[in-house]
Amino acid sequence: SIPWNLERITPPRYRADEYQPPDGGSLVEVYLLDTSIQSDHREIEGRVMVTDFENVPEEDGTRFHRQASKCDSHGTHLAGVVSGRDAGVAKGASMRSLRVLNCQGKGTVSGTLIGLEFIRKSQLVQPVGPLVVLLPLAGGYSRVLNAACQRLASAGVVLVTAAGNFRDDACLYSPASAPEVITVGATNAQDQPVTLGTLGTNFGRCVDLFAPGEDIIGASSDCSTCFVSQSGTSQAAAHVAGIAAMMLSAEPELTLAELRQRLIHFSAKDVINEAWFPEDQRVLTPNLVAALPPSTHGAGWQLFCRTVWSAHSGPTRMATAVARCAPDEELLSCSSFSRSGKRRGERMEAQGGKLVCRAHNAFGGEGVYAIARCCLLPQANCSVHTAPPAEASMGTRVHCHQQGHVLTGCSSHWEVEDLGTHKPPVLRPRGQPNQCVGHREASIHASCCHAPGLECKVKEHGIPAPQEQVTVACEEGWTLTGCSALPGTSHVLGAYAVDNTCVVRSRDVSTTGSTSEGAVTAVAICCRSRHLAQASQELQ
Amino acid sequence: QEDEDGDYEELVLALRSEEDGLAEAPEHGTTATFHRCAKDPWRLPGTYVVVLKEETHLSQSERTARRLQAQAARRGYLTKILHVFHGLLPGFLVKMSGDLLELALKLPHVDYIEEDSSVFAQ
């Protein structure tokens, strides 16, 4: 019968006793930077080309016995998970292996850098189809390793890496912390985060998604027909590399940004038990388990968005946090979140010719996060319209006044330490969907975009009584682009998007005063692109 | 890697050369920074990646590496250039004493220097 991990990544319409996805990734080359491999293993024979690249440190230990089967164990298993005949994800993908880890699974940042450079030079000398680079390794945070990954990604290469097995914040490790890399955490057959002894999968905002990574059957280097079960975020990353290979084989022109958005979009949502993660990391960690798309074609009509969290600002009064979208993505909205509730809102601002989302801490606050909603919107022209604090009883408002521009997000930012909580909340006058409304002491920022066929609508969910969380979701066919809270008063901790749902968090109800102060409205802006839908229909 | 600790090839004689002049001094006001792994046991002191500014050409990378060797030799230090990077990042990998970091950070074109560190199979 089909191994649990292959079943888990297969959409229901393809499920059978055998794992037979429609395209095996035959147009894609996957580079594996790992240990040496047993290339004559029946699972991978003829599928993996061992390059002559080797850059590894000496093994540790007062007595070290080099056994080929032990030296090849990690890499052979991963090659099998990516493209193995029986237990592989992308059975048609061809692979090339580079040895950057020694027989004990240890390598160096410098060796990995030289390996990445080798791949880039190979790509220049002999350009082939889409390239996926699998980095099933991790070290401490490294500026230079992250920079090399960024350069390779900007050359059109898709990099997939292990989040790390340290039961820790993935942002403290490289290449897991490189924003351009697809970083993969590990889950088990119960869709729970993988525990590895005292340790386990890494988590946090630097993880893009999770994938099967416990008890994964794959090629064993003990013999040419042996199989073995291994666990770790390397195995999880290998699944995503295989899925990426299949998606790229079906749509070779996909950019990294498009691929990442699709991986997120087709993942299983909200199946991971977040209680396993440290409390302060739960909101930052994506609750996504990778899966193949139900159909390899025809996803192009969708408006894809993802949520990007910034690093924590730190507690100083003037501290700020910045969240950025990938180069090919549009920032369609910006929100902020603070666990203490002490924040001064957020705003979108230009930085290096691109919009970024900046959140502001307040005096006595423990720090803030900026949350960017990053979307794929071809031919988009977006700008930010700002209204300064109105000081009028009706509150501050701003709208998209340019012809053909629609509202995709609202942000508010205030200079005062605490927005007055005694004033009644201002709710949006009905029938004015292109308008942002906020507290009279706040400046309001509207993200206004023009793109072919783009249409958006505002959806609100207000509750009169205090509640820790208010949510509002976009319906089928619409994509959440903006998420904000009304009013912006101090008991609101902030707003953020989780998949297609806008979440507004408030202080613990027991600490909230009157019910009028507790009234909170979650405001979602839901968009779709008729243009993308038409283009997709024309293709079919 | 072919070399072992203490086995320094390419020993550089302390010859005064055009490489050792002060032409191409670092641009005013720009300070190169030094980075190392926050996890001490994973550090590999003695090997450093010298990353040069983005538009640096291969010839300049090689020249900067030779200049470092010459200046180090004048101070009685042996260095070994293990690799010159080009294609992804401009720069070079050098085996040298940590005592030379201050000197290396002042070289022209240097953006930052990172001490090598370990990575592990996951």
Partner: antibody, heavy 122, light 111 residues
Framework: QVQLVQSGAEVKKPGSSVKVSCKAS????????MHWVRQAPGQGLEWMGL????????YYADSAKGRFTISRDNSKNTLYLQMNSLRSDDTAVYYC???????????????WGQGTTVTVSS | QSALTQPPSVSGSPGQSVTISCTGT????????VSWYQQLPGTAPKLMIY???KRPSGVPDRFSGSKSGNTASLTISGLQTGDEADYYC???????????FGTGTRVTVLG
């Protein structure tokens, strides 16, 4: 649950040998390095040695070198400590302990056996 | 194998905080991860802290670790009678190519 179960107490004469075992359960034994640690009566902990998860590498304390050998049988999920030329100062409780993770955390011990008392007396 | 240096004993009343120091050299604590172990009377040691300041799941957050230079510290806040035990620090020593434990500290809860 995860546990290490050690063999029973031993009483030995000076100059003799003994082999202590440690059987692992409820975890993937061949994924973890293993340590031996001893504790003489009323004394502190003394590390004896470490064996890599696949048996390919090892380290020993000076006091164990030459006389003590650590081995493992991954097919039986069992770790061994062979002690030769026993002396009276080898009298101690011997603990096996699991190394916390892969190579990057081999040196912390997160699961301990219940201990085996070895008494060396004439 | 020379041990890391710990005070022989520390004591405190219930609810108080106590700190145990562990002093080594640059070849162990200064450049290696430090772990802390608790040994209750008559039982095997138990890992309380690893990599200077991380707690395995199940270890209360009353236990915290830190490191400065060649000295590591374990702080037990909100002391409880169940915390009475011997505590050992431990670290790899790169010059010895071996693991070294601290001399051990007995924690006594008064009253």
């Amino acid at each position: 649950q995860v546990q290490l179960v050690q063999s029973g107490a031993e009483v030995k004469k000076p100059g003799s040998s003994v082999k202590v075992s440690c059987k692992a359960s409820a975890f993937t034994f061949d994924s973890f390095g293993m340590h031996w640690v001893r504790q003489a009566p009323g004394q502190g902990l003394e590390w004896m040695g470490l064996l890599w998860s696949d048996g390919s590498g090892e380290y020993y304390a000076d006091s164990a070198k030459g006389r003590f050998t650590i081995s493992r049988d991954n097919s039986k999920n069992t770790l061994y400590l062979q002690m030769n030329s026993l002396r009276s100062d080898d009298t101690a409780v011997y603990y096996c302990a699991r190394a916390m993770g892969a190579i990057y955390y081999y040196y912390a011990m997160d699961v301990w056996g219940q201990g085996t008392t070895v008494t060396v007396s004439s | 194998q020379s041990a890391l240096t710990q005070p022989p004993s520390v004591s405190g009343s219930p609810g108080q905080s106590v700190t145990i120091s562990c002093t080594g050299t640059s070849s162990n604590i200064g450049n290696q991860f430090v772990s802390w172990y608790q040994q209750l009377p008559g039982t095997a040691p138990k890992l309380m802290i690893y990599e200077y300041n991380k707690r395995p799941s199940g270890v209360p957050d009353r236990f915290s670790g830190s490191k400065s230079g060649n000295t590591a510290s374990l702080t037990i806040s909100g002391l409880q009678t169940g915390d009475e035990a011997d505590y050992y620090c431990g670290s790899w020593d790169s010059s010895l190519s071996g693991y070294v434990f601290g001399t051990g500290t007995r924690v006594t809860v008064l009253g």
